[in-house]
């Protein structure tokens, strides 16, 4: 799998989409996990509804939400109030028994907000109590890592 880069602005919402073959993954729940190191496990962040029929319902874990269009074949993850610590490598997964197939490898990059919210005066910033439905979702910038680019740069 190539890694797709999604860039979002700190404090705003980032939407990550993972297309998949809806026939092949028929009846299978999906999940969003965070990769812990290059060869480490992928730690589950949030998964779709326990009943596959209800996968279209948005499920949330903290500031992350997931919803699945099972007929269209698109899994959508929304990271709300994006923070620097959200940057990193993730996977969209399809769950099959005790196994998990990788649908897409994702690198989330968090860009500094060009507006300094502390000096923004009356600028409205979504509060923690705001629902995902009300959150403003920015169009994400995404690209695939070029051949030869290192997803996990060696640490010094």
């Amino acid at each position: 799998h190539n890694t797709t880069v999604f860039q979002g602005v700190e404090g705003q919402s980032l939407q990550v989409s993972c297309p998949y073959d809806s026939m092949k993954h028929w009846g299978r729940r999906k999940a969003w996990c965070r990769q812990l190191g290059e060869k480490g496990p992928c730690q589950r962040v949030v998964s779709t509804h326990n009943l596959w029929l209800l996968s279209f319902l948005r499920r949330r874990n903290g500031s992350t939400a997931i919803t699945d269009d099972t007929l269209g074949g698109t899994l959508t993850i929304t990271l709300r109030n994006l923070q620097p610590h959200d940057a990193g490598f993730y996977q969209c997964q399809s769950l099959h028994g005790s196994e998990a197939d990788t649908l897409r490898k994702v690198l989330v990059e968090v860009l500094a907000d060009p507006l300094d919210h502390r000096d923004a005066g009356d600028l409205w910033v979504p509060g923690e109590s705001e629902s995902f439905e009300d959150a403003h979702v920015e169009h994400s910038i995404s690209r695939s890592l070029l051949e030869g680019e290192i997803p996990f740069p060696p640490t010094s």
Epitope: M23, K24, G27
Partner: antibody, heavy 119, light 106 residues
Framework: QVQLQESGPGLVKPSGTLSLTCAVS?????????WSWVRQPPGKGLEWIGE???????NYNPSLKSRVTISVDKSKNQFSLKLSSVTAADTAVYYC????????????WGQGTTVTVSS | DIQMTQSPSSLSASVGDRVTITCQAS??????LNWYQQKPGKAPKLLIY???NLATGVPSRFSGSGSGTDFTFTISSLQPEDIATYYC????????FGGGTKVEIK
Amino acid sequence: QVQLQESGPGLVKPSGTLSLTCAVSGGSISDSAWWSWVRQPPGKGLEWIGEIYHDADTNYNPSLKSRVTISVDKSKNQFSLKLSSVTAADTAVYYCARDTKYWGGMDVWGQGTTVTVSS
Amino acid sequence: DIQMTQSPSSLSASVGDRVTITCQASQDISNYLNWYQQKPGKAPKLLIYDASNLATGVPSRFSGSGSGTDFTFTISSLQPEDIATYYCQQYVEAPTFGGGTKVEIK
């Protein structure tokens, strides 16, 4: 249009392995569909055995999972069923079928082949 | 496993009669249900998919309805060639079939 044809031994000994092949013609096994096996014991209803996708991903009936293996051979445009440790209860007509799920159901079936488990 | 309960198990009707078969799922399956016709010694034939869609080449006297757990299959005017066993089948999870309904002519 797509046609399916089952083939394999009609008689298998108890505790042996039942092996059947389904040849796909008039289309490609790489088409967007699941390729299924369904069986029907004499005078009884239909039982789904399992299915395979062209990339060799499989789903099996939980009650048969420990004994079933379904494989695909894209070069020959066919898929196969192996059922191990058979008993008389596995005597049935075995059908292969194409399953397009929401997009059209099990819309193409083979004519079926009778397999008898007996010594 | 999702259980499919079909009723009646058999019925006898006259040519031209309206015939109705019901199928009940043990849990919500939305409209993910198919109906098949099987004549003696033949493979099953798809009649209705997604609860209410008529498969290609199937006469319009066959119809299906329902959603959730309760489904109905109807032959609006029974014909001699409709003598067969009819099965419902869900495909939300591992596919399961109803027990079948044998339709005979009076």
